[in-house]
């Protein structure tokens, strides 16, 4: 009678997370009598996965009916596989012992590799907004994938970026892995509508990569350009001065009119017009009663945009040519408006 052999025909098995792994094992003899046990790992720290005779193993089912006469198929199925189940599984024949069973012979082992999908990439940008021509960093993270091989690409508006660094952790063997990438992006004034995309390709995704996006509208600040102009005289003693605030983003903006350095009026941009590139324009008027001034007037349009230090533009209003009206207490009539509300 030939001595019993334990045969594990598969050196390795690859299973997708959530699926069922089948680990094959056959014995060549019924003798010696005794249970088959399955272990993950070898040596004293090995983990018992299944014992034919003792204990309950709810995740494990046998492929064949072990109670059938002459059964020598000890293959098992492990349900709902997770990356934590990865490892080498050994089918071990024990000889019935008294009081304890004695290990008799082990199979060569089957390495179970678990294919786990990466999580949806999460892209995050800088904490503070930045202005055009500045370089900002975006990070992309994805977790829980296996095997380790993974491809990550960055795009800005469909154009692939090259300035990025990527790390996959841990470096050594692990049940699952994480990827972290940082890309550098140079902002332009046209980037309000731009998107940065992180694309992750992995064997589990069957050619359909996962994408994470960040809108540069969350990152960019386009400072306004100011232009102060004097409109033709509406009445003999009135001058209409406009401050054109152009190409700014985001919308948060406060405008202050100063007459010779004194605050005349403050207003917040409300009804703005949007440009094709996503930036905004806004206009404010100041109606100046020139008869109230003896000297020239310095009008300043001061704009505070998105909490940044104010920028301003001034205009000198010549009043010497206008006759002085005596007894006038009002220096200026203030009217704030915009392009849609001209009166």
């Amino acid at each position: 009678e030939e001595e019993l052999q334990v045969i594990q025909p598969d050196k390795s098995v690859l299973v997708a997370a959530g699926e069922t792994a089948t680990l094959r094992c056959t014995a060549t003899s019924l003798i010696p009598v005794g249970p088959i046990q399955w272990f993950r790992g070898a040596g004293p720290g090995r983990e018992l996965i299944y014992n034919q005779k003792e204990g309950h193993f709810p995740r494990v089912t046998t492929v064949s009916d072990l109670t059938k006469r002459n059964n020598m198929d000890f293959s098992i199925r492990i349900g709902n596989i997770t990356p934590a189940d990865a490892g080498t599984y050994y089918c071990v024949k024990f000889r019935k012992g008294s009081p304890d069973d004695v290990e008799f012979k082990s199979g060569a082992g089957t390495e179970l590799s678990v294919r786990a999908k990466p999580s949806a990439p999460v892209v995050s940008g800088p904490a503070a907004r930045a202005t055009p021509q500045h370089t900002v960093s975006f990070t992309c993270e994805s977790h829980g994938f296996s095997p380790r091989d993974i491809t990550l690409k960055w795009f800005k508006n469909g154009n692939e970026l090259s300035d990025f660094q990527t790390n996959v952790d841990p470096v050594g063997e692990s049940v699952s892995y994480s990827i972290h990438s940082t890309a550098k992006v140079v902002l332009t004034r046209e980037d309000v509508h731009s998107q940065v995309i992180c694309e992750v390709a992995h064997v589990t995704l069957q050619g359909d990569p996962l994408r994470g996006t960040a809108n540069l509208s969350e990152t960019i600040r386009v400072p306004p350009t100011l232009e102060v102009t004097q409109q033709p005289v509406r009445a003999e003693n009135q001058v209409n001065v406009t401050c054109q605030v152009r190409k700014f983003y985001p919308q948060r903006l406060q405008l202050t009119w100063l007459e010779n350095g004194n605050v005349s009026r403050t207003e917040t941009a409300s009804t703005v017009t949007e440009n094709k590139d996503g930036t905004y324009n806004w206009m404010s008027w100041l109606l100046v009663n020139v008869s109230a001034h003896r000297d020239d007037v310095k009008l300043t349009c001061q704009v505070e945009h998105d909490g940044q230090p104010a920028v301003s533009k001034s205009h000198d209003l010549k009043v010497s040519a206008h006759p002085k009206e005596q007894g006038s207490n009002t220096a200026a009539e203030n009217t704030g408006s915009n392009e849609r509300n001209i009166y």
Partner: antibody, heavy 121, light 111 residues
Framework: EVKLEESGGGLMQPGGSMKLSCVAS????????MNWVRQSPEKGLEWVAE??????????HYAESVKGRFTISRDDSKSSVYLQMNNLRAEDTGIYYC????????????WGQGTTLTVSS | DIVLTQSPASLAVSLGQRATISCRAS??????????MYWYQQKPGQPPKLLIY???NLESGVPARFSGSGSGTDFTLNIHPVEEEDAATYYC?????????FGGGTKLEIK
């Protein structure tokens, strides 16, 4: 340590009923087929009944001499096996052993000490 | 049913000698190369104790002086050298098919 302990034996009149119980300990009861074997001076050792596992749908088998009169059952949650005996006859007299079948092949590796049934008028 | 006939019904063997007990089945109890025959020892007031499984394999904890052989319909239990504690009744049992049956027993006496 594997232990099998029978109870329920005693003196019964012909035509009567009796239920034998066997409580198991020291092993995972639900993983083993269980059997009853009886012994008498007249008939020697006689296999009576077998009950298999849940995965076998608790299949049962009986000796021809007790078929239709005896019922074997098990309660895995109580690690117990039972033998309900109806319409008892004098020839059912004997020591009833509760037995563990180690390898699903009438491999009777552990026997209880037995409980005695006497059927007599 | 498969009938198992044991012989002799009793025998007396001197200490240290060989005891041989025979069991003949009315039909083969062998399938797929395995012989579904078992041997038990029973002492007074105790349940039977398994000695040999599948005709020739020693149950764990059983002394090596016990051995089994045979196939098909003819099987033998040997005890050598016999010791005093071996005085008992020996039974063969098959599991070739249902119902399982036992031999009538062989009583071994030590001289």
């Amino acid at each position: 340590e594997v232990k099998l302990e029978e109870s329920g034996g005693g003196l019964m009149q012909p035509g009567g009923s009796m239920k034998l119980s066997c409580v198991a300990s020291g092993f995972t009861f639900s993983n083993y087929w269980m059997n009853w074997v009886r012994q008498s001076p007249e008939k020697g050792l006689e296999w009576v009944a077998e009950i298999r596992l849940k995965s076998n749908n608790y299949a049962t088998h009986y000796a021809e001499s007790v078929k239709g009169r005896f019922t074997i059952s098990r309660d895995d949650s109580k690690s117990s096996v039972y033998l309900q005996m109806n319409n008892l006859r004098a020839e059912d007299t004997g020591i009833y052993y509760c037995i563990r079948d180690y390898d699903y092949d009438a491999y009777f590796d552990y026997w209880g000490q037995g409980t005695t049934l006497t059927v007599s008028s | 049913d498969i009938v198992l006939t044991q012989s002799p019904a009793s025998l007396a063997v001197s200490l240290g000698q060989r005891a041989t007990i025979s069991c003949r089945a009315s039909k083969s109890v062998s399938t797929s190369g395995y012989n579904y025959m078992y041997w038990y020892q029973q002492k007074p007031g105790q349940p039977p104790k398994l000695l040999i499984y599948l005709a020739s394999n020693l149950e764990s904890g059983v002394p090596a002086r016990f051995s089994g052989s045979g196939s098909g319909t003819d099987f033998t239990l040997n005890i050598h050298p016999v010791e005093e504690e071996d005085a008992a009744t020996y039974y063969c049992q098959h599991s070739g098919e249902l119902p399982y049956t036992f031999g009538g027993g062989t009583k071994l006496e030590i001289k």
